[in-house]
Interface confidence: medium
Amino acid sequence: GELETSDVVTVVLGQDAKLPCFYRGDSGEQVGQVAWARVDAGEGAQELALLHSKYGLHVSPAYEGRVEQPPPPRNPLDGSVLLRNAVQADEGEYECRVSTFPAGSFQARLRLRVLVPPLPSLNPGPALEEGQGLTLAASCTAEGSPAPSVTWDTEVKGTTSSRSFKHSRSAAVTSEFHLVPSRSMNGQPLTCVVSHPGLLQDQRITHILHVSFLAEASVRGLEDQNLWHIGREGAMLKCLSEGQPPPSYNWTRLDGPLPSGVRVDGDTLGFPPLTTEHSGIYVCHVSNEFSSRDSQVTVDVLDPQEDSGKQVDLVSAS
């Protein structure tokens, strides 16, 4: 007769491992007992269990409650056992020793491999600001057995670097994603992808990029100076900028306080019916946590009467 087993049994952490051992004997041969032991190199054999033809399954105290026979129906020549709830420490060499009559003893070894699926974590780097050089955007760490694979999925241009730390029964892999921050990256997804034989599908953790910036400020509303004349209603100045985080706006007048009746509404400065008092230099001050910008414009409110007088003068002068 001969023993049938597997060279390697692979199981995911927490699952049950079937340790196969089947005696393919000649007719009339009987199995007296099947002894299972852990036989890692450099250590003495540690008994798991014994399948006895008379006593049935007897489990070593060290493995009490963790070793069972596979569910029926069972072949009397089958010495396979189930190791319940495999843990990382179970990884190693196991030996099945079959005592048969009249053929004698047979033994076979197998290796139990316990896959420890990783639990990845993503850590964002320092705050990203436009104008920085190459900066850490995020790092992704996954520890498992065997070592997991850590990659990045993104449309953002950047560079990656990985390092691995080996522990006694597992390995931790850390991958870093570096980029040169620009405002176009704002809101873009950066996804860490972890692959491992113990995972049914890749694990993905997505980080949304936030790049701090503040665009130059500009003021709209003075495109047609002729519209800024005494008596005009609804005149307004609008401050244009954009940023991350969204900026706040503040209006001041350089050559004095804001005239009465002028309304500040965020990025907009609204005027009452225009008078010459509204002429002056107005400053839009834009700021966020990252930076601040100023833009100033000169408002010159025209007096239509003066203008018509001048025209007459000009005509008469000609």
């Epitope: 007296g32 007992q33 002894a35 003495g44 054999a45 008994e47 014994l50 006895h52 008379k54 006593y55 007897h58 489990v59 070593s60 105290p61 009490e64 020793r97 005592s99 048969t100 009559f101 004698g104 003893s105």
Partner: antibody, heavy 119, light 107 residues
Framework: EVQLVESGGGLVQPGGSLRLSCAAS????????MSWIRQAPGKGLEWVSG????????GYADSVKGRFTISRDNSKNTLYLQMNSLRAEDTAVYYC????????????WGQGTLVTVSS | DIQMTQSPSSLSASVGDRVTITCQAS??????LNWYQQKPGKVPKLLIY???TLQSGVPSRFSGSGSGTDFTLTISSLQPEDFATYYC?????????FGGGTKVEIK
């Protein structure tokens, strides 16, 4: 039929030595855990020593540690107990017994051999 | 080492009586407990293993129970051939240890 036959007992003076043997037949001796158990006259059972199938695991009772040595020869289907520095309190019937492993019951016993330590 | 304490050390009973022998372990041994019967001048014979499993060929009037530290051997209806000494033994760890024995005598 399983048979365990002890031999080697006898009268010995305190401080002397004896070697007990246990010849096994009717089962695959090389697969079984073997033990020596003794019983002093009119007293209870005391496990003396045990040895695993491949001699990889050996245990002794505190009362004999350092004086007794258990061994086996699987090619001869024989278990041994070398007893040195014998004392009067070692006087007993010595049984050999087999079990599938140390955590299984002692299912087969020999008839025993009497060791008497006396001056 | 694990100490095994058996009680009583002896008892007198009549044929047909129900007899109970207890065995206490000095620490938790789960169900790694065996019971043996020994008659005068004879070799010990295994009665019960794993605390409650009857060895094949042993009459069903013998039963065992318990787990952890406290165990019981019960003979439901004592027969003439049951007068003997009974020993408990733990197989949880080496050194293997026996109880002191309980001698069951005829009243």
């Amino acid at each position: 039929e399983v048979q365990l036959v002890e031999s080697g007992g006898g009268l010995v003076q305190p401080g002397g030595s004896l070697r007990l043997s246990c010849a096994a037949s009717g089962f695959t001796f090389s697969d079984y855990y073997m033990s020596w158990i003794r019983q002093a006259p009119g007293k209870g059972l005391e496990w003396v020593s045990g040895i695993s199938w491949n001699s990889g695991s050996i245990g002794y009772a505190d009362s004999v540690k350092g004086r007794f040595t258990i061994s086996r020869d699987n090619s001869k289907n024989t278990l041994y107990l070398q007893m040195n520095s014998l004392r009067a309190e070692d006087t007993a019937v010595y049984y050999c017994a087999s079990s599938g492993s140390w955590y299984l019951p002692l299912d087969y016993w020999g008839q025993g051999t009497l060791v008497t330590v006396s001056s | 080492d694990i100490q095994m304490t058996q009680s009583p050390s002896s008892l007198s009973a009549s044929v047909g009586d129900r007899v109970t022998i207890t065995c206490q372990a000095s620490q938790d041994i789960s169900n790694y407990l065996n019971w043996y019967q020994q008659k005068p001048g004879k070799v010990p014979k295994l009665l019960i293993y794993a605390a409650s499993t009857l060895q094949s060929g042993v009459p069903s009037r013998f039963s065992g129970s318990g787990s952890g530290t406290d165990f019981t051997l019960t003979i439901s209806s004592l027969q003439p051939e049951d007068f003997a000494t009974y020993y408990c033994q733990q197989s949880y760890s080496t050194p293997l240890t026996f109880g002191g024995g309980t001698k069951v005598e005829i009243k």
